[in-house]
């Protein structure tokens, strides 16, 4: 008996061939001997089966001795043995229809679980193997689960269902809703304008939701809300903003925030949370602000940084075009009695300068100038 695998919702064509290459009488029946369709001369006739409105044949092939049964919009319950009767012989074809669906939605938040469920006919024992867009293979029976979805899991998942050494392939498009970056860090000199950007890693036609930037300043004992906002069809409207700092928010995507000036009391880390309509759970992006200040007080030249710096970052003070006078893995460095000239304060990571502030030290009889 020939086995044919079909996909739920698809169309399948079951073949039936006579030895004579001409149009002769044929009938297709199911395992209960109920007629599905056949011919009377050149006319297609249909029987009382439940496939009535979804069954068809190709009259153009009858003259060549081919009498296919076409079943449209396949259902799991169409799985059956179909019998073609032609020239006093019977050809049996076993049709097995499978369906593969993603749990609830194909748009999932980063960190959520994806469950793929296989619908299969009674008596079948298929195996399923799925390959994610990043090449990860998962295997299972009726259900396959992937926990903690990551951004790289966005794209087409290809799943192969194997039964009776035949296979059928399903493609499911999954969209992982996430920010492009889980975390970002902004380095600024004191007084500079700060731009925070929160680009999304997906595009949808209508994006509606709400969000909040919650901030923990390094110098503050507790965290607080800096801004709350709504998102309606990709238009941003500010709901509430703290009075200090006076943040501004762009009206269009990507989500964009401007802090008029970087000050030591703002240095710290924040968490932008975005809740999307009709989704349980939230998207998060961490953002960090490091602020540098270089000052000269009397005979002491000081450079300080505030905010979340890694212990491997190096803070240095050097006179322009000279070797560093002081260089430490600390958040403050200073030079006593600095000589006149343009001094540079540098925050660097493995030799790469992340932040630089210049301060001009004048001869001792005058006051310092900040360029």
């Amino acid at each position: 008996k020939k086995v044919v695998l079909g996909k739920k919702g698809d169309t399948v064509e079951l073949t039936c061939t006579a030895s004579q290459k001409k149009s002769i009488q044929f009938h297709w029946k199911n395992s209960n001997q109920i007629k599905i369709l056949g011919n009377q001369g050149s006319f297609l006739t249909k029987g009382p089966s439940k496939l009535n409105d979804r069954a068809d044949s190709r009259r153009s092939l009858w003259d060549q001795g081919n009498f296919p049964l076409i079943i449209k919009n396949l259902k799991i319950e169409d799985s059956d043995t179909y019998i073609c009767e032609v020239e006093d012989q019977k050809e049996e074809v076993q049709l097995l229809v499978f369906g593969l669906t993603a749990n609830s939605d194909t748009h999932l938040l980063q960190g959520q679980s994806l469950t793929l469920t296989l619908e299969s006919p009674p008596g079948s024992s298929p195996s399923v193997q799925c390959r994610s867009p990043r090449g990860k293979n998962i295997q299972g029976g009726k259900t396959l689960s992937v926990s903690q979805l990551e951004l790289q899991d966005s794209g087409t998942w290809t799943c192969t269902v194997l039964q009776n050494q035949k296979k059928v392939e399903f493609k499911i498009d999954i969209v992982v809703l996430a920010f492009q970056k889980a975390s970002s860090i902004v380095y600024k000199k004191e007084g500079e304008q700060v731009e925070f950007s929160f680009p999304l890693a997906f595009t949808v036609e209508k994006l509606t939701g709400s969000g909040e930037l919650w901030w923990q300043a390094e110098r503050a004992s507790s965290s607080k809300s800096w801004i709350t906002f709504d998102l309606k069809n990709k238009e941003v409207s500010v709901k509430r903003v703290t009075q200090d700092p006076k943040l501004q928010m762009g009206k269009k995507l990507p989500l964009h925030l401007t802090l008029p000036q970087a000050l030591p009391q703002y240095a710290g880390s924040g968490n932008l949370t975005l809740a999307l309509e009709a989704k349980t759970g939230k998207l998060h992006q961490e953002v960090n602000l490091v602020v540098m200040r270089a000052t000269q007080l009397q005979k002491n030249l000081t450079c300080e940084v505030w905010g979340p710096t890694s212990p491997k970052l190096m803070l240095s003070l050097k006179l322009e075009n000279k070797e560093a006078k002081v260089s430490k893995r600390e958040k403050a460095v200073w030079v006593l009695n600095p000589e006149a000239g343009m001094w540079q304060c540098l925050l660097s990571d493995s030799g790469q300068v992340l932040l630089e502030s210049n301060i001009k030290v004048l001869p001792t009889w005058s006051t310092p100038v900040q360029p």
């Epitope: 507790s222 809300s225 809740a275 309509e277």
Partner: antibody, heavy 119, light 107 residues
Framework: EVQLVESGGGLVQPGGSLRLSCAAS????????MSWVRQAPGKGLEWVAN????????YYVDSVKGRFTISRDNAKNSLYLQLNSLRAEDTAMYYC????????????WGQGTLVTVSS | DIQMTQSPSSVSASVGDRVTITCRAS??????LAWYQQKPGKAPKVLIY???SFQSGVPSRFSGSGSGTDFILTISSLQPEDFATYYC?????????FGQGTKVEIK
């Protein structure tokens, strides 16, 4: 430790006035919106009014508009609710609450002060 | 004004039971929804904000879900200290409004 302590409640005749106070401590009072919420005996919670950090924005529930006034004194770390033209239906426990929680939630509440309007 | 309707108004349950309280807003409130717990003679305390996020210190048996206009507070396994009245509250638009409350009583 964040603390909110209400005072000023008491028995007042219909048409009378009261001034409720809320003394805040343990946090930077001037950085937060503040709210008043009331609860009639045996009934549910009803949000009454709120005020922004510097007192320039105020919102009220319709039933108290024109009769109640919310204000604050950041120098004294105090929130106030002036209750005028009081009615029997204003009888309730009045709570002061800080809008310091995420997603605009009321994260700290006082223990309340009882206002009874009766002749 | 946005009306918040809670159901049921009261529920009798035993320790270990799963309790579900629903809250329906008269119009969409996005994720501006919080749940509060109040015990007799005490001030309310926030359990959940932004529909589904826990306030720190709140046991994980409490969970929130929903979106738009329909929201649910679930207590997965009721503990003796959970017998109280629960309120939902919207902060989408002024005036902020609370649900009428759901009293969770001992069966």
């Amino acid at each position: 430790e964040v603390q909110l302590v209400e005072s000023g409640g008491g028995l007042v005749q219909p048409g009378g006035s009261l001034r409720l106070s809320c003394a805040a401590s343990g946090f930077t009072f001037s950085s937060y919106w503040m709210s008043w919420v009331r609860q009639a005996p045996g009934k549910g919670l009803e949000w009454v009014a709120n005020i922004n950090q510097d007192g320039s924005e105020k919102y009220y529930v319709d039933s108290v508009k024109g009769r109640f006034t919310i204000s604050r004194d950041n120098a004294k770390n105090s929130l106030y609710l002036q209750l005028n033209s009081l009615r029997a239906e204003d009888t309730a426990m009045y709570y002061c609450a800080r809008e310091g929680g995420q997603w605009l939630s009321l994260d700290y509440w006082g223990q309340g002060t009882l206002v009874t309007v009766s002749s | 004004d946005i009306q918040m309707t809670q159901s049921p108004s009261s529920v009798s349950a035993s320790v270990g039971d799963r309790v579900t309280i629903t809250c329906r807003a008269s119009q969409g409130i996005s994720s501006w929804l919080a749940w509060y717990q109040q015990k007799p003679g005490k001030a309310p305390k926030v359990l959940i904000y932004g529909v589904s996020s826990f306030q720190s210190g709140v046991p994980s048996r409490f969970s929130g879900s929903g979106s738009g206009t329909d929201f649910i507070l679930t207590i997965s396994s009721l503990q003796p200290e959970d017998f109280a009245t629960y309120y939902c509250q919207q902060a989408n638009s002024f005036p902020w409004t609370f649900g009428q409350g759901t009293k969770v009583e001992i069966k």
